[in-house]
Each structure stands twice: as structure tokens, then as C-alpha cells.
């Protein structure tokens, strides 16, 4: 099931992946000025069976001003350092998730990638959250979010993080003030609404994702 | 990789309302992209209406269209709305969908600036007299 939210945004705060669940998809998305290969990949999908894991499909970026087809290779270190600078400021290890079973690491990066990696999560995918460089965290909890289905729905748990400035007075613990609800939020943990939603359950998503979904959502 | 399309401007009476639409096409999920919507007046730069985040969890609106102004998407139609309440006539300009994507494996789940939207339609005219 793919998970059909945006996870919790946390003021000043960035999150990431330290791994994939099977049946992550990675658009192949290229830079400006390339384009996939037109019997290219639309997207890496993260597969595997009880001991192994690894990506499927490889992305290929081609000019659009050509027809010729690009190999992959390392990115030139300019290339490398333009995608670092999406990076958070200091490294988050909170366990190594990408040894768990039924995960896969980050994938490498192609010739011509673009700078912005969209993944499409599936239930059960855990992101860690992190302040942002000038900032530092208050905890009252994990400051980690899990994909959840909750009543035929998805929905991310909240993260227990606030980002403070460094030259702002910190609270004493237990004196937090409560997350304000970004606005259009959905803030509901426990009750559970029985309503009519466009939500699909997106099954056997991989058989059939090189057909006819690329122009409309799932249908 | 994608294509915009905007339709449902034209002109309205001060005070009226006017629904805009932005299909996607191309072969890629729309869910993959944040969408947004800018404006141009004649003689003035491009300038941020508002925006929604990939699955419409999170909406951002410029001061000027605050409250007047409502933007929803539906995925499964890959089409992004601007409803326009109580339109007043500075409110007259083209008005352009756009799409952006995320930085990294990170959110900033929506984008207000331009530059920072990698698609774009070729907008449509919406006019409000008074």
C-alpha cells in the first residue's frame, strides 16, 4: 500500500529515510536540460525476498536536444556536490536501517539525475526527523514518523520534535507548548470517521505500473 | 516530463467567483509534485498565489488571496483547483499552474518561489471588473 499522505512537517526541521520497504518506487527523474531515455525506466522500485533486497530498474538520463542514449556512471563531482547541498548539516544514525530485512538502501546516483529524489513510500516506512542547521531539538519523544494504515486510510504518526533557535530561551521540560497544526492538517490519532474518500487501495501496484497510471493517479 | 494545462479563466463582476483547472499529463505519477499557483498583471512580476503539498495536506496562500482564494488537488484526476471567492479587480492577470519537487529524500512540502518550481502551463487570462 503506498502510503497517501504527506508526512508531518516540523518547523525548521528536515527529515530523511535511512531506508526503503519493499515496494518504495524512485521516479527516475533527470536534470534540466535531460529527459529518461524513451525505453526508459519511469521509476526504480525496491524489491526483494527474505534475505535480499535491492532495487529494480535502472534510471537512464539522456540530452534532450539528442537521440543517444547515456550510460550510467558516477556523476562528476560537481554533480555530486550540487545534490550534497539537499543534505541535512550533520549525519543521522539512528539505527541502520538499511540492514534490516525487507529494505534497501539509497540507491546510487545515475548520470544527469536531478537534484530532487521523489520517492513514493509504502506503509510501514519510518523517516527521522532533524533540525535544521541553526536550530537544536527539544525531544519529548522519538523524533521519527511511521506510515500507518489506520481504518482502510494512511496516515504518518507525529514526530515528538520541536526545533528551538539557539538564542531562544528553552523551555524546562514539560513545559513545551503543544505543535500547532499546520494548516490543512489533518489532526486526528485516535477517532476514526467513516466517510466516503478518493483514497485507492493501490494493490498489485507493481505488475502494473508501466501501463496506463503515468497519465492518471491509480486508477 | 509533465505538462500543464489550465483552463476556467475569463471574466468575472467584482465580487464573483471563478473556478481554475490545471490537468498534468505526461508519464509520471502526479502525486510526485507539490503544485502551485502564480499570476502575472501586466507590466508586474510573476507573483506566488498559493500552493498544496503532493497529497494536499498542507496548503500556503500569499496575504493578498487569504481567505478569498481555496486550492485543492485530486490525484486520481491529476488536476489541481483554484477556486476564486469575492474576486476583486487587482486580482485580474494571467494566472500560471507550476509543479515542484522535492529536495532529497527531505521535504519542504510547499514551495513559494518561483525559481523553485521546475514545470509550468502556459496560463490563462482571468479578468474581474468593476
Known amino acids: 500500500e503506498l502510503c497517501d499522505d504527506d508526512p508531518p512537517e516540523i518547523p525548521h526541521a528536515t527529515f530523511k529515510a535511512m531506508a526503503y520497504k519493499e515496494g518504495t518506487m524512485l521516479n527516475c527523474e533527470c536534470k534540466r536540460g535531460f529527459r529518461r531515455i524513451k525505453s526508459g525506466s519511469l521509476y526504480m522500485l525496491c524489491t526483494g525476498n527474505s534475505s535480499h533486497s535491492s532495487w529494480d530498474n535502472q534510471c537512464q538520463c539522456t540530452s534532450s536536444a539528442t537521440r543517444n542514449t547515456t550510460k550510467q556512471v558516477t556523476p562528476q563531482p560537481e554533480e555530486q556536490k550540487e545534490r550534497k547541498t539537499t543534505e541535512m548539516q550533520s549525519p543521522m544514525q539512528p539505527v541502520d536501517q538499511a540492514s534490516l530485512p525487507g529494505h534497501c538502501r539509497e540507491p546510487p546516483p545515475w548520470e544527469n539525475e536531478a537534484t530532487e529524489r521523489i520517492y513514493h513510500f509504502v506503509v510501514g516506512q519510518m523517516v527521522y526527523y532533524q533540525c535544521v542547521q541553526g536550530y537544536r531539538a527539544l525531544h519529548r519523544g522519538p523524533a521519527e514518523s511511521v506510515c500507518k494504515m489506520t481504518h482502510g486510510k494512511t496516515r504518518w504518526t507525529q514526530p515528538q520534535l520541536i526545533c528551538t533557535g539557539e538564542m531562544e530561551t528553552s523551555q524546562f521540560p514539560g513545559e513545551e507548548k503543544p505543535q500547532a497544526s499546520p494548516e490543512g492538517r489533518p489532526e486526528s490519532e485516535t477517532s476514526c470517521l467513516v466517510t466516503t474518500t478518493d483514497f485507492q487501495i493501490q494493490t498489485e501496484m507493481a505488475a502494473t505500473m508501466e501501463t496506463s497510471i503515468f497519465t492518471t493517479e491509480y486508477q | 516530463q509533465v505538462q500543464l494545462v489550465e483552463s476556467g479563466g475569463g471574466s468575472v463582476q467584482a465580487g464573483g467567483s471563478l473556478r481554475l483547472s490545471c490537468e498534468a499529463s505526461g508519464r509520471t505519477l502526479f502525486s510526485s509534485y507539490g503544485m502551485g499557483w502564480f499570476r502575472q498583471a501586466p507590466g508586474k512580476e510573476r507573483e506566488f498565489v498559493g500552493a498544496?503539498?503532493?497529497?494536499?495536506?498542507?496548503?500556503s496562500y500569499a496575504d493578498p488571496v487569504k481567505d478569498r482564494f481555496t486550492i485543492s488537488r485530486d490525484n486520481a484526476k491529476s488536476t489541481v483547483y483554484l477556486q476564486m471567492n469575492n474576486t476583486k479587480p487587482e486580482d485580474t492577470a494571467v494566472y500560471y499552474c507550476?509543479?515542484?519537487?522535492?529536495?532529497?529524500?527531505?521535504?519542504?512540502?510547499?514551495?513559494?518561489?518561483?525559481?523553485?518550481?521546475?514545470?509550468w502551463g502556459q496560463g490563462t487570462q482571468v479578468t474581474v471588473s468593476s
Open positions: 507550476a509543479a515542484y519537487t522535492y529536495s532529497g529524500s527531505f521535504y519542504s512540502t510547499v514551495k513559494t518561489h518561483h525559481d523553485e518550481y521546475r514545470y
Open positions: 498544496i503539498s503532493r497529497f494536499g495536506t498542507y496548503t
